[in-house]
C-alpha cells in the first residue's frame, strides 16, 4: 500500500463528439487552473493493515501532506469523528498521547505522520470491514480527515501482503507528483491557448449520444472548480471500498459521487481503482471541541449554516472533536 498525491487523468476527447470536444477544450483550462490552485491543499492519507501474525490486530498509519504545523491528531473507528466514530487515540505534539481500548500503541512516526496498533482480542476488537479515520488539525489552517478500511477479502494468513512501493516519502511523492502535473498542465494549457488562437471556437452543440452531457459538463468549471478550491482531498490508501460511504462521509450530499470535484469523479472500476480514488476530506475551521462536549450536553461554537470550509472570522480553530457533534 502506498500513499500518493492523486492527479486526475487527462483523457483524450472521445472521437465523434464534436460539441463535447469543443466543450472539453473550454473545460480543460478550468480544470488545470483548479489543479494549480489546489496544488497546495493539504491532504490526509490513511493506511490500514491487518497483521499476519495476529489475525485481528490492525496497524493504522496516517499522514498529513501540508505545510502547517500539526496541533492535534485524532484517530477514531466506526466512521469520522462527527459521525459517531469512537476515539481510539489523541496525539498532541507537546502534551503527549492518550489512547483508549482497543488501541495498544499510538506513536508519532514523523512530525506529520502517526501509527496506531490495535489489540486483536476482546469484545471491542476491530473487524475486517471497520472504518478507521484520522483527523489532523493544523494550526492555523484548520482540520482535515480521511478514512480507510481493509478490503473485505483480506486474509493475511493466506494472501501475501501488498507489495510495498519504492520507498519514497509521501510528502515528497506528493510534491513531485503535483509538480509534474502542474508542469504538464501549464505546457498543455499553453498548447491549448495557441491552438485556440489559430482556429475558430467550435459551436457548443448538445451531444446526440447523451442529451444530458452538455449540462453535466457545463457544471464542471463553476461548481467543480469551487469544490476543488475549497474541499481538501484525502486519499484512501486501502484497497477496498469503506463499508458505508454515507457513514464515512456524511457531508457528501445526496450521493457520495456527487460530492466529488468533477475532475476526480470517475467511478472506480474495481478494488484497484478504489485504492487510489481521492475523496473529499472534511476540511473545517471549527473548534476541536465541538464534538467533545456532546456527552456533557454542551454546545459547540456556532459555525453558521452547514459546514464551514473557510477560515472562521473569529480566528483559527483546531478541529471537530473525537466524540461526534450534536
Amino acid at each position: 500500500m502506498r500513499t500518493e498525491a492523486q492527479v486526475p487523468a487527462l483523457q483524450p476527447p472521445e472521437p465523434g463528439l464534436e460539441g463535447a470536444m469543443g466543450h472539453r477544450t473550454l473545460v480543460l483550462p478550468w480544470v488545470l487552473l483548479t489543479l494549480c490552485v489546489t496544488a497546495g491543499t493539504p491532504e490526509v492519507w490513511v493506511q490500514v493493515r491487518m497483521e499476519a501474525t495476529e489475525l485481528s490486530s490492525f496497524t493504522i498509519r496516517c499522514g498529513f501532506l501540508g505545510s502547517g504545523s500539526i496541533s492535534l491528531v485524532t484517530v477514531s473507528w466506526g466512521g469520522p469523528n462527527g459521525a459517531g466514530g469512537t476515539t481510539l487515540a489523541v496525539l498532541h505534539p507537546e502534551r503527549g498521547i492518550r489512547q483508549w481500548a482497543p488501541a495498544r500503541q499510538a506513536r508519532w512516526e514523523t512530525q506529520s505522520s502517526i501509527s496506531l496498533i490495535l489489540e486483536g482480542s476482546g469484545a471491542s476488537s476491530p473487524c475486517a470491514n471497520t472504518t478507521f479515520c484520522c483527523k489532523f488539525a493544523s494550526f492555523p489552517e484548520g482540520s482535515w480527515e480521511a478514512c480507510g478500511s481493509l478490503p473485505p477479502s483480506s486474509d493475511p494468513g493466506l494472501s501475501a501482503p501488498p507489495t510495498p512501493a519504492p520507498i519514497l516519502r509521501a510528502d515528497l511523492a506528493g510534491i513531485l507528483g503535483v509538480s509534474g502535473v502542474l508542469l504538464f498542465g501549464c505546457v498543455y494549457l499553453l498548447h491549448l491557448l495557441r491552438r485556440h488562437k489559430h482556429r475558430p471556437a467550435p459551436r457548443l452543440q448538445p451531444s446526440r449520444t447523451s442529451p444530458q452531457a452538455p449540462r453535466a459538463r457545463a457544471w464542471a468549471p463553476s461548481q467543480a472548480s469551487q469544490a476543488a478550491l475549497h474541499v481538501p482531498y484525502a486519499t484512501i490508501n486501502t484497497s477496498c471500498r469503506p463499508a458505508t460511504l454515507d457513514t464515512a462521509h456524511p457531508h457528501g450530499g445526496p450521493s457520495w459521487w456527487a460530492s466529488l470535484p468533477t475532475h476526480a469523479a470517475h467511478r472506480p472500476q474495481g478494488p484497484a481503482a478504489w485504492a487510489s480514488t481521492p475523496i473529499p476530506a472534511r476540511g473545517s475551521f471549527v473548534s476541536v471541541e465541538n464534538g467533545l462536549y456532546a456527552q456533557a450536553g454542551e454546545r459547540p461554537p456556532h459555525t453558521g449554516p452547514g459546514l464551514t470550509l473557510f477560515p472562521d472570522p473569529r480566528g483559527p480553530r483546531a478541529m471537530e472533536g473525537p466524540l461526534g457533534v450534536r
Epitope: 476515539t87 498532541h92 502534551r95 483508549w100 494550526f139 492555523p140 471541541e289 456527552q295 480553530r317
Partner: antibody, heavy 118, light 107 residues
Framework: QVQLVQSGGEVKKPGASVKVSCKAS????????INWVRQATGQGLEWMGW????????DYAQKLQGRVIITRNTSITTAYMELSSLRSEDTAVYYC???????????WGQGTTVTVSS | DIQMTHSPSSLSASIGDRVTITCRAS??????LGWYQKKPGKAPKRLIY???SLQSGVPSRFSGSGSGTEFTLTISSLQPEDFATYYC?????????FGGGTKVEIK
C-alpha cells in the same frame, strides 16, 4: 448530570499528609484526565498535576514533585490527590477538574479546603 | 514553563461597560487557551475554550479572541454577576499555567 464531588475540608499539622478525593459521575471517567489545581488565600490558581484515568499515567508540577501523588480507583470512578510533608503555605482550596485531553478543564469539583496549622 | 501575563491586574467598571482583559503568553501557544471566571468560595467556571469558542451555558456577552501569544477576553456589557476574577489558562504544554488573574470590581 456531569459532576465532580470532592471530600470535605481538613485541618492538618505541618509535616502531615492529606488525601483529597474527587468522585466523578455523569460521564465516562476513563475518557478524561483529571487535573488538580489549588488556590491559596489571596493568590491565583496553581496547577498541581494530572492523571489519565484510562492508562494511569500522571505528571506533576515541578514545585510539588516528590510531595504529591495522584491516584485513582476506576471501579468507583474516584480520583485522589495526596500531598505529603505539609507546610503552612499548602493551606489552600484544592480543586479537581475534568479535562477532555487536550482542551483544558471544563468541569470542576466544588473545592476542598485544607488548612495546615500547628 | 510558559508564563501567562494578565493586564490589567485589576479594573473598576460600571454595569453596562465594555470590559477587555488581555493575556500574553511567553511563547506561542496556538489557540490552546481558556478563560475562567472565579468568584470567592466558588469553583472556577470556564467561559471560553480554544481561545474564542463560547462554553455552553455562558452568556454571549463574553467573547474571546487571539492566537499565538496575545489573547483577549471581552465582556460586551458588564452585568452585576460578572464582578469576579478572570484567569486565562494555557493548555498547550505541561505544566499547564494560569495567568495571575484580573479582578473586575464595581466602580
Amino acid at each position: 448530570q456531569v459532576q465532580l464531588v470532592q471530600s470535605g475540608g481538613e485541618v492538618k499539622k505541618p509535616g502531615a499528609s492529606v488525601k483529597v478525593s474527587c468522585k466523578a459521575s455523569g460521564f465516562t471517567f476513563t475518557s478524561y484526565d483529571i487535573n488538580w489545581v489549588r488556590q491559596a488565600t489571596g493568590q491565583g490558581l496553581e496547577w498541581m498535576g494530572w492523571m489519565n484515568h484510562y492508562s494511569g499515567d500522571s505528571d506533576y508540577a515541578q514545585k510539588l514533585q516528590g510531595r504529591v501523588i495522584i491516584t485513582r480507583n476506576t471501579s468507583i470512578t474516584t480520583a485522589y490527590m495526596e500531598l505529603s510533608s505539609l507546610r503552612s503555605e499548602d493551606t489552600a482550596v484544592y480543586y479537581c477538574g475534568r479535562e477532555r485531553f487536550p482542551f483544558g478543564m471544563d468541569v470542576w469539583g466544588q473545592g476542598t479546603t485544607v488548612t495546615v496549622s500547628s | 514553563d510558559i508564563q501567562m501575563t494578565h493586564s490589567p491586574s485589576s479594573l473598576s467598571a460600571s454595569i453596562g461597560d465594555r470590559v477587555t482583559i488581555t493575556c500574553r503568553a511567553s511563547q506561542g501557544i496556538r489557540n490552546e487557551l481558556g478563560w475562567y471566571q472565579k468568584k470567592p468560595g466558588k469553583a472556577p467556571k470556564r467561559l471560553i475554550y480554544s481561545a474564542s469558542s463560547l462554553q455552553s451555558g455562558v452568556p454571549s456577552r463574553f467573547s474571546g479572541s487571539g492566537s499565538g501569544t496575545e489573547f483577549t477576553l471581552t465582556i460586551s456589557s458588564l452585568q452585576p454577576e460578572d464582578f469576579a476574577t478572570y484567569y486565562c489558562l494555557q493548555h498547550n504544554t505541561y505544566p499547564l499555567t494560569f495567568g495571575g488573574g484580573t479582578k473586575v470590581e464595581i466602580k
